[in-house]
Every structure is written in C-alpha cells, then in structure tokens.
Amino acid sequence: FKVATPYSLYVCPEGQNVTLTCRLLGPVDKGHDVTFYKTWYRSSRGEVQTCSERRPIRNLTFQDLHLHHGGHQAANTSHDLAQRHGLESASDHHGNFSITMRNLTLLDSGLYCCLVVEIRHHHSEHRVHGAMELQVQTGKDAPSNCVVYPSSSQDSENITAA
C-alpha cells in the first residue's frame, strides 16, 4: 500500500482552521491479522529522508495523536488531550485520515508528516509516510481562507479550501 497526500502545500491566514489530509492507497487487507497505526507529527526536510525527525505538534507527540485500528475502520484520537490543544485526528472507512488544527498561529508553520504502520502477526512492520507544508500568513498578503495546492501528480491549479 502507499500513502498519497492530495495537497502538498496549505497556505492559511492566522486564526483560521485547517485540515491536513492523507489517503491510504492500494490493497488494504481488512483481515483480523492486520492492524493499522496512523499518526501525525512535525518534521524537517532531512538530507537523507523527509519525515525521519519526529517533532510534536503543539506539544503533542506522534504517540498522543495516534489512531490504531484494523483495515479501513473509522477512528478518532482521544478527544480531551488533543482538543485542549486545538487538534483532532480522524480516519474514515475509505482510507482517508486527517488532522484538524484550530486557530492557527505563525508557530504552526512547517512540515507535517502523516505516518501509517501496517502491523501483521509474526511479520515486520511496513511503514509509509506522506509530507506536506503548512504556511500560516499574517498581514495584508495573507489569503482570506486557506488555499491548498495539489501535489505534483495532480492538477497544478490551486484550490481554495471550503
């Protein structure tokens, strides 16, 4: 399986909410001997590999933000801790998973990574990740709403998030 990032860049005004999204692609085994661990974290563009570094998002670690379930089941992060930090990660039945960040500040700008770990009984884990950039802007040059830019494999025209 692979992870797709529909958008590689999100440009948002300060104070706005944004939902960063990843999508699980390819055959996903829904059997009971496979489970998926999905999470989010901040990172840096490493020389060898993007997303190798794992930094917290608003003081919450990737472990605080994880979703853990089988196949394409829906799931949400434990609400209290995440919501106190204006965060919520979620996953649906179609392989989409996301993190919503509320009331953005300039400090939220940076590289964000989604991670999926496929876990099978008596097997090594299979890890895949996706990366996207969030730019939070302020002042007269800031957009009035978040503007999202598709990843290079998709239409290059920018799309304004609803």
Epitope: T35, Y37, Q63, H66, I119, R120, H122, S124, E125
Partner: antibody
C-alpha cells in the same frame, strides 16, 4: 508520565519456570509493542521478542522462541514474559521496553534480575 | 539476521574531549538505527533515533550520523556523567539487534 514497572528479582532452580511482569502507566497500553531484552554480564543486549497488547501479535527472536512466552493483560495494563526450563544460561537481567509502532525503544523498565542456581 | 558491529569494546577519554563511536551494519538499514546509553546499574536510555536525531531532552553534545551500513555516534565535549556503555541498534526488520556496546571510560 510514561513508566514501565517491572517485578522483583527472582532466584530459581534449574528446570523451573519464571514469569516476569511489566506494568505500564501513562499511555494507551494497547497502542505500543512491549519489547523484552536480555542482558547477561559481558554479553550486551539481546532482543527476545515483542508483543502488541490487545491484538496479542507477537514476534519472537528465533533463538528464544522455545524459551520465552509473551502474554499481556489489557485490563491491568501488564505484560508478562514466562521463561521455561531454566538453566544457568538464563541468569540475566531482563528488561521490558515500550516501542510505538514504526519507532524505537523509547521507555525502558528498571529490569528484573533472574538468577538460576541449584 | 542483521549483525551490528561496534569495533571498539572500550574507549578512554578525558572530560572536554570529543569522542566518536562507530557501528557497522551487515546490510543496508537506511537510517533505521538508534543509539542508547546505559549508565552503571541503570536501564538503557534512547539518545539518538533515525541515525541522527536527538530524542527528547537529550543534550546537544550528543550527535549521530550515517546511513546505509556505517554509523557514527559523537559526544562533542565529554562530561563526567557520560561514563556509560553505548549501544547501536537497528530497527530495519525483525529481529531487532544491538551492537556489542562500547564502554566509555573517563580518565
């Protein structure tokens, strides 16, 4: 604060079995692997295997698959390792450690010393 | 199984010195390695993950580098409290294996 509390030291007879416990606090127990590591004086660290509580997925080091058995009880957030048919070679300190999937051994217990002696 | 080889079992250094410990994997492990510190009478502690990133709360005198099969762990200015055994470990595929350890002695 994430912590792993291990059971106390054990003095065992050759041929006996011992069950070591590792109780987790401060995180969702079922979301991380519990790793088991052996350390004999002058022998460094040896990975015995791992269990993912809740799913009971396990991976054993081939060398220890007939020696160690891993179980976990999610109602008490405790993982167990049973060592069977003990010999002097099994005298060691045994550590449990937490490993989030796709990650490293980020929190370790204090270790349980097992001594096998007649 | 992937074998992790730390060529030096012992290294002697003085406070303030720079010291580097090497680790070689028997096959390509990308950057999927960690370095652990084990002080006398204590359990190991994660210092470096993904070959070059410091774990939470680890002082910046500790650094890691390398990819593929050759890795280096460096303490830029050794402190008395750095007396410990240092282990590399790969996290590429099970079974996870550790290097034999390098004991750092402070002169």
């Amino acid at each position: 604060q994430v912590q792993l509390q291990q059971s106390g030291a054990e003095l065992m007879k050759p041929g006996a079995s011992v069950k070591i416990s590792c109780t987790a606090t401060g995180y969702t127990f079922s979301s991380c692997w519990i790793e088991w590591v052996k350390q004999r004086p002058g022998h460094g660290l040896e990975w015995l295997g791992e269990i993912l509580p809740g799913s009971d997925y396990t991976n054993y080091n081939e060398k220890f698959k007939d020696k160690a058995t891993f179980t976990a009880d999610t109602s008490s957030d405790t993982a167990y390792m049973q060592l069977s048919s003990l010999t002097s070679e099994d005298s060691a300190v045994y550590y449990c450690a937490r490993r989030p999937p796709g990650w490293y051994f980020d929190v370790w217990g204090a270790g349980t010393a097992v001594t096998v002696s007649s | 199984d992937i074998v992790m080889t730390q060529s030096h079992k012992f290294m002697s250094t003085s406070v303030g010195d720079r010291v580097s410990i090497t680790c070689k994997a028997s096959q390509d492990v990308s950057t999927d390695i960690a370095w652990y510190q084990q002080k006398p009478g204590q359990s190991p502690k994660l210092l470096i993950y993904s070959a070059s990133y410091r774990f939470t709360g680890v002082p910046d005198r500790f650094t890691g580098s390398g990819s593929g099969t050759d890795f280096t762990f460096t303490i830029s200015s050794v402190q008395a409290e750095d007396l410990a055994v240092y282990y590399c470990q790969h996290q590429y595929s099970t079974p996870w294996t550790f290097g034999g350890g390098t004991k750092l002695d402070i002169k």
